[in-house]
């Protein structure tokens, strides 16, 4: 009743290792690190066999099979490259995840390198088995914005791709008679979120209640250049419309809102997010130059009454932009306080424009981003949103445009997007 000598499997061992095995002796077959016991097509960690009364083993010696991590998981907005020849996915093989540059970057500058572990899972030194995250790159247009623009009043045509964050927001309330239709601008913050002014998305009521328009009435166009040709643009419906809870319709304080898109939009040379600023109550410094784009009125002699009577005919077909300096807060406050009417330039606003006029944003540009180039990060940052202006014609002398100071709302924006400030990397480094 002595059993035959045993040969350990390739890449494996048998324990205990004895010269002779007799009835009732048991042997445990195991494999080297990175290999699994394979018996009858079933993978296991160990396998036990016993020497039987008749001098035979209870089972054949199993084989040791190299661990296979199989095809790695797909990475949204990312690519996988195999570092090992023949695209091997077995133990100790290596793969590298990367993001679709230049539109996405890897969160926390992760290496993206994963190794097939002995347990059969792809492992990263920092993230473990979790996949990396590809975040949209922000504030880096595929076309460089010109360093100087003389004088979307007094503005000029924008080349396609100059303002890849620019969104056209169309609100159409078909439930009203006659149909209500208006539009504004917005700025893409991520593949799923648009930042705009609250007054663009407030339901047009006669009272002072602040109720958002129904999401069904909102369409957002991205990658749009000429409003007459929407074929190359991405259009999306809204999943959520969020007005800042403190928005005040009487003085336009807290004039900020967000639209969550029904589906994330694909990023590309004409569709890219703008960066959010740091949380700082000061906002942009006086005299800093910013750019604003929009499809609003580009004729300086058009009055608000004429626009209302002529519908959208006075709007620009092609996206316009203008370069404007930030006006010292006290100067702007004074210029509005000296006017008849109850104008309030609050701490949540800043002004931009020229004392002599001639360059300004106007009706229809509402919600558009006032962007400033951040020298540190070399990115464009949304510091303002087109909010309101004086009763005179757009571009009038000493009538500055008033913008929502975005830096006061960074926390609220991140929260709504599900990424509160405390846990996200600031998009613009100090």
């Amino acid at each position: 009743n002595e059993c035959p000598e045993l040969q350990p499997p390739v890449h494996g061992k048998i324990e205990p290792s004895q010269a002779k095995y007799f009835f009732k002796d048991q042997v445990l077959v195991s494999c080297d690190t990175g290999y699994k016991v394979l018996k009858d097509n079933v993978e296991m960690d160990t396998f036990q066999i016993e020497c039987l009364k008749d001098g035979t083993w209870s089972n054949k010696i199993p084989t040791c099979k190299i661990v296979d991590c199989r095809a790695p998981g797909e990475l949204e907005h990312g690519l996988i490259t195999f570092s090992t020849r023949n695209n091997l996915t077995t133990y100790k093989s290596e793969i590298k995840y990367s993001c679709q540059e230049p539109y996405y970057k890897m969160l926390n500058n992760n290496t993206g390198i994963y190794t097939c572990s002995a347990q059969g899972v792809w492992m990263n030194k920092v993230l473990g088995r979790s996949l990396p995250t590809c975040l949209p790159e922000c504030g880096q247009p595929s076309r460089s914005l010109p360093s100087l623009v003389k004088r979307i009043i007094g503005g000029r045509n924008a080349e396609p791709g100059l303002f890849p964050w620019q969104a056209l927001i169309v609100v159409e309330d078909t439930s009203r008679v006659p149909n209500d239709k208006w539009f504004g601008s917005g700025a893409l913050l991520s593949a799923s979120w648009i930042l705009t002014a609250a007054h663009v998305l407030r339901s047009q009521r006669r009272d002072t209640t602040v109720i958002p328009v129904s999401k069904e009435h909102v369409t957002v166009y991205l990658g749009l250049h000429d409003v007459r040709d929407k074929s190359g643009a991405v259009n999306s419906s809204a999943a959520r419309v969020v007005l800042h809870p403190d928005f005040n319709i009487q003085n336009y304080n807290h004039d900020i809102a967000l639209v969550q898109l029904q589906e994330p939009v694909p990023l590309g040379p004409h569709v890219m997010p703008v960066c959010l600023p740091r949380l700082e109550p000061e906002g942009p410094a006086p005299h800093m130059l910013g750019l604003v784009a929009g499809w609003g009125i580009s004729n300086p002699n058009v009055t608000v009454d004429e626009i209302i009577s002529s519908g959208t005919r006075t709007l620009s077909d092609v996206l316009q932009y203008v370069k404007l300096p930030v006006v010292p807060h006290a100067e702007c406050k004074t210029s509005y306080e000296s006017r008849s009417g109850n104008y309030s330039v609050t701490e949540n606003m800043f002004c931009a424009g020229y004392y002599e006029g001639g360059k300004d944003t106007c009706l229809g540009d509402s919600g558009g981003a006032f962007v400033i180039f951040d020298d540190l990060s070399q990115r464009w940052v949304v510091q303002g949103l087109v909010s309101w202006g004086g009763p005179e014609e757009c571009g009038s002398k000493q009538v500055y445009g008033v913008y929502t100071k975005v830096s006061n709302y960074v926390d609220w924006v991140w929260e709504q997007m599900g990424l509160p400030q405390s846990v996200v990397e600031p998009q613009v480094e100090r």
Partner: antibody
Framework: QVQLKQSGAELVKPGASVKMSCKAS????????IEWMKQNHGKSLEWIGN????????KYNEKFKGKATLTVEKSSSTVYLELSRLPSADSAIYYC?????????????WGQGTLVTVSS | DIVMTQSQKFMSTSVGDRVNVTCKAS??????VAWYQQKPGQSPKALIY???YRYSGVPDRFTGSGSGTDFTLTISNVHSEDLAEYFC?????????FGSGTKLEIK
């Protein structure tokens, strides 16, 4: 550190008015609105309204319009809540609170509460 | 007004247990929900904001989850000092509203 110190307990007669205070310290007073909540004995919290010391903006819950009035004394960094025409149902603890972020209305800092008892 | 419903007025648990406190909003409030803890005779204290983010100094046994209309506060490994009432609050729109509260009792 941020502190909100509320005035002491009040015993008032039905139909009368009461004015309580909330003195803020440890931060720039004009940067954040002050919120007010009511909590009946053993009950939940109700948001009454808020007051922004920077520009005097106030917002009220419809339920408390005409009942609650919010005012400020900037020199002492104090916001006041005045409640008028008090019935016994207004017996409650009244809390003032401050947001963590100025633009995001959840309340990280709370006063110790002012107990108001309406009884004849 | 948005109604925040905390269906369980009381919850009984033992030290070391895991407990889920739930809150339902009458309409979509996105992630704008906060959770507060109130111990007898004390003011409320913020635990969670933006549905799932712990406020500084809050022990990591407290976690929040949910978005839209359904929200949960989970206390894993309940401590005796967690005996308190827990309130949810929406701050998506005015008037800000609170749930009716859930009292946690330790067996």
């Amino acid at each position: 550190q941020v502190q909100l110190k509320q005035s002491g307990a009040e015993l008032v007669k039905p139909g009368a008015s009461v004015k309580m205070s909330c003195k803020a310290s440890g931060y720039t007073f004009t940067t954040y609105p002050i919120e007010w909540m009511k909590q009946n004995h053993g009950k939940s919290l109700e948001w009454i309204g808020n007051f922004h010391p920077y520009n005097g903006d106030s917002k009220y819950n419809e339920k408390f319009k005409g009942k609650a009035t919010l005012t400020v004394e900037k020199s002492s960094s104090t916001v006041y809540l005045e409640l008028s025409r008090l019935p016994s149902a207004d017996s409650a603890i009244y809390y003032c609170a401050r947001r963590h972020y100025a633009a995001s209305p959840w309340f990280a800092h709370w006063g110790q509460g002012t107990l108001v008892t309406v009884s004849s | 007004d948005i109604v925040m419903t905390q269906s369980q007025k009381f919850m009984s648990t033992s030290v070391g247990d895991r407990v889920n406190v739930t809150c339902k909003a009458s309409q979509n409030v996105g992630p704008t929900v906060a959770w507060y803890q109130q111990k007898p005779g004390q003011s409320p204290k913020a635990l969670i904001y933006s549905a799932s983010y712990r406020y500084s100094g809050v022990p990591d046994r407290f976690t929040g989850s949910g978005s839209g209309t359904d929200f949960t506060l989970t206390i894993s490994n309940v401590h005796s000092e967690d005996l308190a009432e827990y309130f949810c609050q929406q701050y998506n729109s005015y008037p800000f509203t609170f749930g009716s509260g859930t009292k946690l009792e330790i067996k």
